[in-house]
Interface confidence: medium
């Protein structure tokens, strides 16, 4: 089953990487009690969401990227 | 139509035990997580426990630790709570809410979309 | 634990009017909020999930913004129906928790 149904994880799979200039803005989950591993989430300019792979290199360089922007939270 | 049908609440002594059943249709009971939350008379809402769809992962309020217990029967599409060692301030209706989560690409939350009409405890001597 | 601050506790208007009922997060909490409203006697209901999005068969007269620690839903044109009482929650993390609540009522 997906990792969403057995803890609170929001991130039933992710992309390996997205295009930056489709990116709003990107949330960093950290593990806890409702989830037990980092989740990195996109939410995109048409309004949804996507999850990342935060072992992902381009995923790494998106959230540096965004950091510097201000856009990561 | 999705539905869910709270039974079990009652007049209890302080120190006595209830056990509150969530009957559920409509939908796919296995695939989501549960909650219990309750509303003292006249208050608010505050979550009491959840649980995953399939039993594996349960969670608690910490008013409610080591003196609830929350448990579903997926062959029954039913879910339960277990209250012992109960106390006045545990008067309140409780509701079971259907956690729906919604699936964007790669991504999912959690929302109590679908609620009961909600059961009352009365926990009195 | 999270917790989550709503002001005004209490608030009169008249039906025509536009509201709007402020949520805090003691952290920031993204936008993994929802709000819900309560009438009397009844269950609550689902309005907004993920802090702006509207669920299925809200009225459009009902929004929610903000992301963060703070958070708003504004009710524009209230009507007779609007009048209950409204709760956000977080659902960041666990425990679970609700805001104590705002109460509209009929000026």
């Known amino acids: 089953a997906p990792l969403a149904t057995e803890l609170r994880c929001q991130c039933l799979q992710t992309l390996q990487g997205i295009h930056l200039k489709n990116i709003q803005s990107v949330k960093v989950k950290s593990p806890g009690p409702h989830c037990a591993q980092t989740e990195v989430i996109a939410t995109l300019k048409n309004g949804q969401k996507a999850c990342l792979n935060p072992a992902s290199p381009m995923v790494k360089k998106i959230i540096e990227k965004m950091l510097k922007n201000g856009k990561s939270n | 139509e999705v539905q869910l049908l709270e039974s079990g609440g009652g007049l209890v002594q302080p120190g006595g035990s209830l056990r509150l059943s969530c009957a559920a249709s409509g939908f796919t009971f296995s695939e989501l997580s549960m909650s219990w939350v309750r509303q003292a008379p006249g208050k608010g809402l505050e979550w009491v426990s959840a649980?995953?769809?399939?039993?594996?992962?349960?969670y608690y309020a910490d008013s409610v630790k080591g003196r609830f217990t929350i448990s579903r029967d997926n062959s029954k599409n039913t879910l339960y709570l277990q209250m012992n060692s109960l106390r006045a301030e545990d008067t309140a209706v409780y509701y079971c809410?259907?956690?729906?989560?919604?699936?964007?690409?790669?991504?999912?939350?959690?929302?109590?979309?679908?609620w009961g009409q909600g059961t009352p405890v009365t926990v009195s001597s | 634990d999270i917790q989550m601050t709503q002001s005004p506790s209490s608030l009169s208007a008249s039906v025509g009017d536009r509201v709007t009922i402020t949520c805090r997060a003691s952290q920031s909490i993204s936008d993994n909020l929802h709000w819900y409203q309560q009438k009397p006697g009844k269950a609550p209901k689902l309005l907004i999930y993920d802090a702006s999005n509207l669920e299925s068969g809200v009225p459009s007269r009902f929004s929610g913004s903000g992301s963060g620690t703070d958070f708003t839903l504004t009710i524009n044109s209230l009507q007779p129906e609007d009048f209950a009482t409204y709760y956000c929650q977080q659902y960041y993390s666990t425990p679970l928790t609700f805001g104590q609540g705002t109460k509209l009522e009929i000026k």
């Open positions: 649980i995953s769809g399939s039993g594996g992962s349960t």
């Open positions: 809410a259907r956690e729906g989560g919604r699936l964007e690409p790669y991504y999912y939350y959690y929302a109590m979309d679908v």
